[in-house]
């Protein structure tokens, strides 16, 4: 899977879209999870309604919402009041029994609010590395990782 980058401004809302084949994933609930480390598990943040027919209903977990257009094949996640700690690697998933298929890998970047003159030192941007290869560009305040970028901040 390529990783698509979605950029949002701190304090504002960011909408992430994950297109999928609605016929292939018929009847399947979806989920949004956060990747813990480069090879770690993906921790569930929020999932769609327990009844697939009601997947269009927005479900919230804290400041994160999820809604699914099951016929059109688009899963939409909204991150409200985006904060620096929201930056990182996520996945859109299609759930099937105990399995989860990855629909899209998403890197969320948090940009400093241009109107906020406080120290932006705690905002994280991906650093340079030669290890990350999957890259393609897709805009809507989003892009894909450039070759050489890594989805996790370097650890000291």
């Amino acid at each position: 899977h390529n990783t698509t980058v979605f950029q949002g401004v701190a304090g504002q809302s960011l909408q992430v879209s994950c297109p999928y084949d609605s016929m292939k994933h018929w009847g399947r609930r979806k989920a949004w999870c956060r990747q813990l480390g480069e090879k770690g598990p993906c921790q569930r943040v929020v999932s769609t309604h327990n009844l697939w027919l009601l997947s269009f209903l927005r479900r919230w977990n804290g400041s994160t919402a999820i809604t699914d257009d099951t016929l059109g094949g688009t899963l939409t996640i909204t991150l409200r009041n985006l904060q620096p700690h929201d930056a990182g690697l996520y996945q859109c998933q299609s759930l099937h029994g105990s399995e989860a298929d990855t629909l899209r890998k998403v890197l969320v970047e948090v940009l400093a609010d241009p109107l906020d003159h406080r120290d932006a030192g705690d905002l994280w941007f991906p650093g340079e590395s030669e290890s990350f290869e999957d890259a393609h560009v897709e805009h809507s305040i989003s892009r894909s990782l450039l070759e050489g970028e890594i989805p996790f901040p370097p650890t000291s």
């Epitope: 084949d21 016929m23 292939k24 018929w26 009847g27 399947r28 697939w52 099937h96 029994g97 399995e99």
Partner: antibody, heavy 122, light 107 residues
Framework: EVQLVQSGAEVKKPGESLKISCKGS????????IGWVRQMPGKGLEWMGI????????RYSPSFQGQVTISADKSISTAYLQWSSLKASDTAMYYC???????????????WGQGTMVTVSS | EIVLTQSPATLSLSPGERATLSCRAS??????LAWYQQKPGQAPRLLIY???NRATGIPARFSGSGSGTDFTLTISSLEPEDFAVYYC?????????FGGGTKVEIK
């Protein structure tokens, strides 16, 4: 008419390879999962695996993983089940079936092929 | 994988009698269960999906019930053409396993 038509009966020797087919018609072949089911003589149904012809995503039952290969050619609306080295224990009737979608979100094998009898004997 | 156990293995009944077939799952499959009928020399035919919904063209004498781990297929009054083997199958998770089957034979 929506249907799945399978290739004819096969008689093979142990160690030989084989590829049987299942051709779909009357519906959008790329938009439905196609499964394969084994039925050994006088026995029950065994779910072997499934393929989504739209992108060739394939899942196998652990019992059949590595024993068979499921593939599809969407340009001719055909799914395949193949063996690289047959064994006498592969003697069985093999069915392909379409995984139909239900309004509730569930799925079920709603259209079945007529079956392909494979006999492996020295 | 989810194991489906069908009982009884064989059911000997007369035409007009009521048939009750059971299918038990090793773990919950919610209502993601289907029933199929297979007659000798024929491919299986879908009877019931979603545990209780009749497939297109299936007579009303066939009904399904249950959810979670215990399911039942009932044939209210057996017709001569109903004597066959019946299989349950779960589509809750891969692999979509089948039960071992119940043969409904003429007494």
């Amino acid at each position: 008419e929506v249907q799945l038509v399978q290739s004819g009966a096969e008689v093979k020797k142990p160690g030989e390879s084989l590829k049987i087919s299942c051709k779909g018609s009357g519906y959008s072949f790329t938009s439905y999962w196609i499964g394969w089911v084994r039925q050994m003589p006088g026995k029950g149904l065994e779910w072997m695996g499934i393929i989504y012809p739209g992108d060739s995503d394939t899942r196998y039952s652990p019992s059949f993983q590595g024993q068979v290969t499921i593939s599809a050619d969407k340009s001719i609306s055909t799914a395949y089940l193949q063996w690289s080295s047959l064994k006498a224990s592969d003697t069985a009737m093999y069915y392909c079936a379409r995984l139909g979608r239900k309004p509730s979100g569930s799925v079920a094998f709603d259209i079945w092929g007529q079956g392909t009898m494979v006999t492996v004997s020295s | 994988e989810i194991v489906l156990t069908q009982s009884p293995a064989t059911l000997s009944l007369s035409p007009g009698e009521r048939a009750t077939l059971s299918c038990r799952a090793s773990q919950s499959v919610s209502s993601y269960l289907a029933w199929y009928q297979q007659k000798p020399g024929q491919a299986p035919r879908l009877l019931i999906y979603d545990a209780s919904n009749r497939a297109t063209g299936i007579p009303a004498r066939f009904s399904g019930s249950g959810s979670g781990t215990d399911f039942t297929l009932t044939i209210s009054s057996l017709e001569p053409e109903d004597f066959a083997v019946y299989y349950c199958q779960q589509d809750y998770s891969w692999p979509y396993t089948f039960g071992g089957g119940t043969k409904v034979e003429i007494k």
